[in-house]
């Protein structure tokens, strides 16, 4: 019986070139948490497991920091990193987990004030 | 290639006990999940035990545990299934499977199996 | 426990037909389904994960869709090689279950 929830951040945003923290947290449930996935759409970014630690996907390896916790964190914001997070929990004796995070990465300020003042 | 051969099968009493090994080669061993699966006579697939990659956690289904004890030999590249107070519905082809490193429930990679008979 | 059930638990069809198997989770497993190919004297392979992604090796003319309870396996373009039992099986909660099977033939 899966007793447990899934708290997340929610929807967050952030600036482009900037980094977030994407967190989520599994409560109510007495249940071994064995891995925790985090991935972007269909794509897999990290891995946390009970036994061997952190694996960050490699094509995310410039970008992508374990932790916080169980945490991720995405460094150098593209607006292309916008779109909804998942972190899977992987727990005994419940099962799986879910969690949904929507990032939105919008043009910095400091950006839009470079763009407008352009020297030809 | 991916390599498991199970051996240890055979014909056992009501109450007996049986030890099976599941030899891997192909693939580093010690960073994978590995379970067993059973295939009764009337073809039907059982998951009956899971191991994680490091040997510090293991899980059951009711059927099986508290009789049934999974471990392993990462030094030897070794699997192993203790059966006792085996019973006749204990009766089956006996499969060692690696896990998905991404996904705990996948079995990836299975060996070809060895037959356990419990009859008096 | 979760139940996986499969329909048809057996099926004719002639090559280069396109089939589809069907399974049914007695609960939402989301999209943790996988499906495996046991050809007659062998043992389980796995051919897709997580509903819809194809394992390595496995030729384009098997697909996987669904989520939630209702699960599809459709092989196109029917192989004499495609003649085996195919299984689903849930990864949502433990204990892992499996379907009881489809059985393929070729007429």
């Known amino acids: 019986m899966m007793t447990g929830t899934i708290e997340t951040t929610g929807n967050i945003s952030a600036e482009k070139g900037g980094s977030i923290i994407l967190q989520c947290h599994l409560s109510s449930t007495t249940a071994q948490v064995t891995q925790v996935n985090w991935e972007q759409q269909d794509q897999l970014l990290a891995i946390c497991n009970a036994d061997l630690g952190w694996h960050i996907s490699p094509s995310f390896k410039d970008r992508v920091a374990p932790g916080p916790g169980l945490g991720l964190t995405l460094q150098s914001l593209t607006v292309n990193d916008t779109g909804e997070y998942f972190c899977i929990y992987h727990t005994y004796p419940d099962g799986t987990y879910t969690g949904r995070i929507f990032l939105e990465v919008l043009e910095s300020s400091v950006a839009e004030h470079g763009a407008r003042f352009q020297i030809p | 290639e991916v390599k498991l051969v199970e051996s240890g099968g055979g014909l056992v009493k009501p109450g007996g006990s049986l030890k099976l090994s599941c030899a891997a080669s192909g693939f580093a061993f010690s960073r994978y999940d590995m379970s067993w699966v059973r295939q009764t006579p009337e073809k039907r697939l059982e998951w009956v035990a899971t191991i994680s990659s490091g040997g510090s956690y293991s899980f059951y289904p009711d059927s099986v545990k508290g009789r049934f004890t999974i471990s392993r030999d990462n030094g030897r590249n070794t699997l192993y299934l203790q059966m006792s107070s085996l019973r006749s519905e204990d009766t089956a082809l006996y499969y060692c499977?690696?896990?998905?490193?991404?996904?705990?429930?996948?079995?990836?990679?299975w060996g070809q199996g060895t037959s356990v008979t419990v009859s008096s | 426990d979760i139940q996986m059930n499969q329909s048809p638990s057996s099926l004719s069809a002639s090559l280069g037909d396109t089939i589809t198997i069907t399974c049914h989770a007695s609960?939402?497993?989301?999209?943790?389904l996988s499906w495996y190919q046991q050809k007659p004297g062998n043992f389980p392979k796995l051919l897709i994960y997580k509903t819809s992604n194809l394992h390595t090796g496995v030729p384009s003319r098997f697909s996987g869709s669904g989520s939630g309870t209702g699960f599809t396996l459709t092989i196109s373009n029917l192989q004499p090689e495609d003649i085996a039992t195919y299984y689903c099986?849930?990864?949502?909660?433990?204990?892992?279950?499996f379907g009881g099977g489809t059985k393929l033939e070729i007429k």
């Open positions: 099986q849930q990864g949502q909660s433990y204990p892992w279950t």
């Open positions: 499977a690696r896990q998905d490193y991404r996904y705990p429930y996948i079995m990836d990679y």
């Open positions: 609960q939402n497993i989301n999209v943790w």
